[in-house]
């Protein structure tokens, strides 16, 4: 699996999508977990609905929500009130009995500022990056246009 | 065993600009993020920043946001901060430390040995 | 930014005695979402880099002695040394853990009588 790399920053909401067969996913609820260590188990943060039919409802725990779109296919984490210690490595996970299929890799990554990012100083809008091996950026940031900036539309 | 091994103390003329290293061995470099921070003499500590070294993303604290860039090159597993307009206010030890959690930007688990930088002409 | 405060700024005591010393945060360092305390006790000893001794205000990094417990909540926090050694003189420091940009109490010198 690559890994996808979301962005946010500290104290805003940070939005996490993965897409999924609907088709061949049909049936199965949904999780979302933090990666621990390179070897170490991936700690269930929160799943979808007990039934699978409501699985559209958003379900919380603490700060993070979990909503799934069983029919187009995606499955949706909301982070809410981001922190510095939310940065991390997760995984979207499809369940099946005990066992559990990873739908995406997620590499968390929060921002003390909407402008810092890989290249100090540089104005960046968020996209996807081919700069590191197996990773791209998904667009994730928001941030407020400057006074006299001109509207750009977000890559993807 | 994890290590930070930092380079060496350096005497610097003020104005001038200085790039300081601190390389990593005993785990995977990438899996952990590094953090610099600045200890004056017999003072407190102050975060200067972060380095992701698997993509590269940075945060700073505001106070040291051009004062300070952190870079990584991950073939040699070694971190790299660049201070410049070096003044006697940034005479100080210079610490790089390891974050405690996996992918994550939390804790100083594991501290290098320090640069001390002094500025004098 | 959250600013870290530490008292006493210094303190000497003789080897077996016990130990106490305040940090305060100028903001919450606990996570409603989790519950957790983001806070961090650091041990620097003379002409060292600073040591991870305690995290999340209560739990000790592991090879950390058990004479040393981190405890409190919110606002304030406390690093007890249930019985000092000669070893544990230096300089401690607190850390919010919490939020950018992290900070330090500014320290607790140890001394030993």
């Known amino acids: 699996h690559n890994t996808t790399v979301f962005q946010g920053v500290a104290g805003q909401s940070l939005q996490v999508s993965c897409p999924y067969d609907s088709m061949k996913h049909w049936g199965r609820r949904k999780a979302w977990c933090r990666q621990l260590g390179e070897k170490g188990p991936c700690q269930r943060v929160v799943s979808t609905h007990n039934l699978w039919l409501l699985s559209f409802l958003r379900r919380w725990n603490g700060s993070t929500a979990i909503t799934d779109d069983t029919l187009g296919g995606t499955l949706t984490i909301t982070l809410r009130n981001l922190q510095p210690h939310d940065a991390g490595l997760y995984q979207c996970q499809s369940l099946h009995g005990s066992e559990a299929d990873t739908l995406r890799k997620v590499l968390v990554e929060v921002l003390a500022d909407p402008l810092d990012h890989r290249d100090a100083g540089d104005l960046w809008f968020p996209g996807e990056s081919e700069s590191f091996e197996d990773a791209h950026v998904e667009h994730s940031i928001s941030r407020s246009l400057l006074e006299g900036e001109i509207p750009f539309p977000p890559t993807s | 065993e994890v290590q930070l091994q930092q380079s060496g103390p350096v005497l610097v003329k003020p104005g001038a600009s200085l790039k300081m290293s601190c390389r990593a061995s005993g785990y995977t470099f990438t899996d952990y993020y590094v953090h610099w921070v600045k200890q004056s003499h017999g003072k407190s500590l102050e975060w200067i920043g972060l380095?992701?070294?698997?993509?590269?993303?940075?945060s700073y604290n505001q106070r040291f946001k051009g004062k300070a860039t952190l870079t990584v090159d991950k073939s040699s597993s070694t971190a790299y901060m660049e201070v410049n307009s070096l003044t006697s206010e940034d005479s100080a030890v210079y610490y790089c430390?390891?974050?405690?959690?996996?992918?994550?930007?939390?804790?100083?688990?594991?501290w290098g040995q320090g640069t001390l930088v002094t500025v004098s002409a | 930014d959250i600013v870290m405060t530490q008292s006493p700024s210094s303190l000497s005591v003789s080897a077996g005695e016990k130990v106490t010393m305040s940090c305060k945060s100028s903001?919450?360092?606990?996570?409603?979402?989790?519950?957790?305390?983001?806070l961090a006790w650091y041990q620097q000893k003379p002409g060292q880099p600073p040591k991870l001794l305690i995290y999340?205000?209560?739990t000790r990094e592991s090879g950390v002695p058990d004479r040393f417990t981190g405890s409190g909540s919110g606002t304030d926090f406390t690093l007890t040394i249930s019985s000092v050694q000669a070893e544990d003189l230096a300089v401690y420091y607190c850390?919010?853990?919490?939020?950018?940009?992290?900070?330090f109490g500014g320290g607790t010198k140890l001394e030993i009588k």
């Open positions: 999340g205000a209560s």
């Open positions: 430390a390891r974050s405690r959690v996996y992918y994550g930007s939390s804790l100083f688990a594991f």
């Open positions: 850390q919010n853990d919490h939020s950018y940009p992290y900070t």
């Open positions: 903001q919450s360092l606990l996570n409603s979402g989790n519950q957790k305390n983001y």
């Open positions: 380095i992701n070294p698997y993509t590269g993303t940075t």
